[in-house]
Amino acid sequence: TGADTEAVVCVGTACYTAHSGKLSAAEAQNHCNQNGGNLATVKSKEEAQHVQRVLAQLLRREAALTARMSKFWIGLQREKGKCLDPSLPLKGFSWVGGGEDTPYSNWHKELRNSCISKRCVSLLLDLSQPLLPSRLPKWSEGPCGSPGSPGSNIEGFVCKFSFKGMCRPLALGGPGQVTYTTPFQTTSSSLEAVPFASAANVACGEGDKDETQSHYFLCKEKAPDVFDWGSSGPLCVSPKYGCNFNNGGCHQDCFEGGDGSFLCGCRPGFRLLDDLVTCASRNPCSSSPCRGGATCVLGPHGKNYTCRCPQGYQLDSSQLDCVDVDECQDSPCAQECVNTPGGFRCECWVGYEPGGPGEGACQDVDECALGRSPCAQGCTNTDGSFHCSCEEGYVLAGEDGTQCQDVDECVGPGGPLCDSLCFNTQGSFHCGCLPGWVLAPNGVSCTMGPVSLGPPSGPPDEEDKGEKEGSTVPRAATASPTRGPEGTPKATPTTSRPSLSSDAPITSAPLKMLAPSGSPGVWREPSIHHATAASGPQEPAGGDSSVATQNNDGTDGQK
């Protein structure tokens, strides 16, 4: 089944054609494409009304459409793999001919949540109801169909063809017939606007006589944005009718001579154009020659005009259109400048915030300020950044180097710090002894206690291994600590001598202990320095590395 009957409506700079025929969306798009168009867009209420008009025209010609609820493809589609997006007016759909998403939509019902299948949109027409401008066709979403299987209730499609401009319809001053042939291969005798490059064939006469004259015209661009047939005077004029037939084909006034001849004229404030038929305002601004937000300003004596642009815009080379001024060329900002339509805005680098003297100035963010420090312990503010540091007994950790992790001194690289038992605590450690031994005053060695339970096989033999003082330890600390007062686990003992005598049992202890209140408050030099943001967004390469690498998402890992 091909595309059969068609209707056409031309308005503004576009023509819409409606076709009946049970085609898939791809076949319908192909049909529009072959003639230089696309399936129609419906980007505004006004455009929806144009499309509705062309559909109404088609339905008047089509005697009996098969379904009460008929659907006509338009150019709104969602490709395979693109998900429904409820946050957007077009829900993740886009117009096949490209172009920007617009806020107008007219969905029939909540859309099916899918990503895998390609989905296409049709206009849903209830043929039992009259088509009213107030009741515009709803958008219905569904599968796009396939050759021979267009989808349920698909009765046709609507194409859209865009043009540089339009010519006015030719005016006949006497009996005759005009046939327009458009660039998209449609023929029509009644168009309210005729697209650029259309041909007009005019056959003058009553139709039943031999004296029929034929004229052929082409809609051309006479000057920029001025489209004209190149004809002069009314067509098919007849002394028999004078001004009585179709106002002599004149746009405004028709003046008859005594011999049956006549001339066209214009009302005050208007002038007759070269075609000797059409009238145009003497005010050159009345034809809205300025584009893109430009305002038309009349010259002296109303003879000519200039276009003026709003602030932040300037005239382009045509002197008719406004283009954005790139204010960032003048470097008005201290750090980053972002050009916006009609203006600009200043932004600050990561680690800075707007402020300081002058427009567009930036000042350092004090990341270490009270209540906003990202560091677990120590924080030092730097220009555009900061770096974290940890207390004695902790090292910097975490992917962004803001956390502090306890150093397990009992398994440190220098070997055990205690002669016998070693208890790691949060931020510190302390030593202990086996049953029957007591801790020496140096807090590291063990000496024989008052009650002997049998000496360990390898008694302590070195005086002082402690590189830092452990926290206060009760004398004769045993190797089997139970739980702390709040039920928190105490430290895990680590023995530095593996061979213990059989009569000196060691019971297992729970894991880790919260840092004792008496932990030393000494600052340790940071192992990661947060590079300043001024040199570009950076982040540490690893937990204990001081190498900064470019972050692939362009954000600063520390901010």
Partner: antibody, heavy 120, light 108 residues
């Protein structure tokens, strides 16, 4: 409420095929896509592919093309995944899942999983 | 394909602690298409956070999610024993959908 009921555990020989089923209830079957996910201790969760029951359209992870075939039966509201030429690498738990109430591929419904063991 | 890297692979925390796990993508992901799942041993995964920061039905308010571009994170403000599980991130930026390797959270 939405439920996805998967077939029971399977022990299959190397080189054989197996067809797993996922029966949906509590919603209109053709309204939601159905996806399949493989889980192993080594590779964790891997998306195999999905099917749109309304149209029969499918999308596959290239790593599983030729290994898995997804189908759906509207009349019984069930989705199927056939795995062929099985090897020990295919031993895994397979889940059917869909995103009924949410958008952007946030899988809010999961079956209980089917354990497939490939062993001679 | 867009590879998701989760870190750390395993983490342990005491009840009441604040924990953060991260998910990095090899290429940018729209925040709408980044989700987190919780899976407990022997159970199916459960959607936990969707579209970066929205909590799924029934998820406690102590959980939160944030991020954009290639870097995302899940945070638990005050860990509870019931939070012990493996957490997976998942993204979609074109087929195939991919999951992270998971972060196993153990409670001390």
């Amino acid at each position: 409420q939405v439920q996805l009921q998967q077939s029971g555990a399977d022990l299959v020989r190397p080189g054989a095929s197996v067809k797993l089923s996922c029966k949906a209830s509590g919603y209109t079957f053709t309204d939601y896509e159905m996806h399949w996910v493989k889980q192993t201790p080594v590779y964790g969760l891997e998306w195999i592919g999905g099917i749109d029951p309304e149209t029969g359209d499918t999308a596959y992870n290239q790593n599983f093309k030729g290994k898995a075939t997804l189908t759906a039966d509207k009349s019984s509201s069930a989705a199927y995944m056939e795995l062929r030429s099985l090897t020990s690498e295919d031993s895994a738990v397979y889940y059917c899942t869909n995103y009924g109430n949410l958008y952007y591929y946030a899988m809010d419904y999961w079956g209980q999983g089917t354990s497939v063991t490939v062993s001679s | 394909e867009n590879v998701l890297t989760q870190s750390p692979a395993i983490m342990s925390a005491s009840p009441g602690e604040k924990v953060t796990m991260t998910c990095r993508a090899s290429s940018s992901v729209s925040s709408s298409y980044l989700h987190w799942y919780q899976q407990k041993s022997g159970a199916s995964p459960k959607l936990w956070i969707y579209s970066t920061s929205n909590l799924a039905f029934g998820v406690p308010a102590r959980f939160s999610g944030s991020g954009s571009g290639t870097s995302y994170s899940l945070t638990i403000s005050s860990v509870e024993a019931e939070d012990a599980a493996t957490y997976y991130c998942q993204q979609y930026s074109g087929y195939p959908l991919t999951f992270g390797s998971g972060t196993k959270l153990e409670i001390k």
